[in-house]
């Protein structure tokens, strides 16, 4: 197959991103004698960066883009798993297309899995964005969860909380939200498995199983929440902690009422 020379050195990034159709006439135009106003880097097409988890079959090409602008023109560099990413770090190298703020990796293999971070910076600021790459067997395959979700939350007593779990799965996955609980003062059952309560699961009456919403939270709802996803190939789970804080003493109502908290427990298998 073609063997491109790597890394490719394209034109330097342009502050008018050719991937962005927006009219930038609102920006101040420079006159002959004045320097342009400095502008810290910013994303020009953030809606095109919303898909963070990319699950790609082996041998395919991956393209990550971070369309940006700023004055002076920002520079673009890429990290893999938080470290400098050099072309000789992967077989076949990679291409950076500075004109379109993108990185291209051809013929991906399992060792390409990881987090890829673009860093866009000029002397007035720096922004970054991370994509998660998983190299998968074509369907059917085990479920894959986006890294960092659900995220830990600290909220005030009585407020609402939303946990999110981003799932990539073929075949159709079964999603469960679980909470670790105590039974008779113990977190672990006689079978050495933790006690859990099923809070929500995909199927009937679950409009959006990837999101768990807790309303009017109490201190009793502090603890570990687990997003567990399974299909007939395998399963994956990720958890987050909820911390419910009381308001400062002077803000507290005279009497605190605690709603009854009913536990439906079973062993986690």
């Amino acid at each position: 197959r073609p063997s491109p020379t790597l890394p490719e050195q394209d034109a330097l990034p342009s502050s008018e991103d050719d991937d962005d159709d927006d009219d930038s006439s609102s920006e101040e135009k420079e006159t002959d004698n004045t320097k342009p106003n400095p502008v810290a880097p910013y994303w020009t097409s953030p809606e095109k960066m919303e898909k963070k988890l990319h699950a790609v079959p082996a041998a395919k090409t991956v393209k990550f883009k971070c369309p940006s602008s700023g004055t002076p023109n920002p520079t673009l560099r890429w990290l893999k798993n938080g470290k400098e990413f050099k072309p000789d770090h992967r077989i076949g190298g990679y291409k950076v297309r500075y004109a379109t703020w993108s990185i291209i990796m051809d013929s991906v293999v399992p060792s390409d899995k990881g987090n890829y971070t673009c860093i866009v910076e000029n002397e007035y600021g720096s922004i970054n964005h991370t994509y998660q790459l998983d190299v998968v067997e074509r369907s059917p395959h085990r479920p894959i969860l986006q890294a960092g979700l659900p995220a830990n939350k600290t909220v005030a007593l009585g407020s609402n909380v939303e946990f999110m779990c981003k799932v990539y799965s073929d075949p159709q996955p079964h999603i469960q939200w679980l909470k670790h609980i105590e039974v008779n003062g113990s977190k672990i059952g006689p079978d050495n498995l933790p006690y859990v309560q099923i809070l929500k699961h995909s199927g009937i009456n679950s409009s959006d199983a990837e999101v768990l919403t807790l309303f009017n939270v109490t201190e009793a709802q502090s603890g570990e929440y687990v997003c567990k996803v399974s299909n007939y190939i395998g399963e994956a789970n990720q958890s987050a902690w909820l911390t419910v804080t009381r308001p400062a003493l002077e803000e507290r109502p005279a009497v605190m009422t605690s709603p009854l908290y009913l536990e439906h427990h079973h062993h986690h298998h």
């Epitope: 491109p4 095109k48 079959p57 082996a58 041998a59 393209k63 883009k65 051809d106 013929s107 067997e137």
Partner: antibody
Amino acid sequence: QVQLQESGPGLVKPSGTLSLTCAVSGGSISSNNWWSWVRQPPGKGLEWIGEIYHSGSTSYNPSLKSRVTISVDKSKNQFSLKLSSVTAADTAVYYCARATDWYDPWGQGTLVTVSS
Amino acid sequence: SYVLTQPPSVSVAPGQTARITCGGNNIGSESVHWYQQKPGQAPVLVVYDDSDRPSGIPERFSGSNSGNTATLTISRVEAGDEADYYCQVWDSTSDHRVFGGGTKLTVLG
């Protein structure tokens, strides 16, 4: 340099099964590539049929999925296409190709006519 | 499913520049590949990954891709460039390969 060569009957009866084989030479079918089938009806454009990885993992065009089977024989360094319940609309030149994100190289193609 | 739209035909005089477009929703996020097919022959890859050329393909062939349009540009067109041209992507959302409908390039004269 990898080369691909299609083989199989040039004439298939309606409602029958079209069977083609693609022999891979100059490289291993176990490399990090997909092995693909593409067809082109007379005077029309290219249509992706499906593909297989050496592990046996497959992907098919949804419009043909119910009739298509692609298999790989690593010992013979070849892969095959079966298309069942054929009609005159399946008359086309059938190409095999090596694929990563793109196709390169291609076989020279073989014309399969569906007719009684 | 993902759709790629090409003009059915493009005509150009020898020595001029031909531009063949391939439209698709946010196609700039995908890698686009282009093939040349002459009558009675198998397709040949002329541009891959938006703008890269395989060895043996003249520098006159170039590509670009942004927004909702990818473009194959053939500069200093020659009579031998007359052929059908197809764009192709692997649609990462559906995990399927997609071809454009093809564009017949006619070299006038």
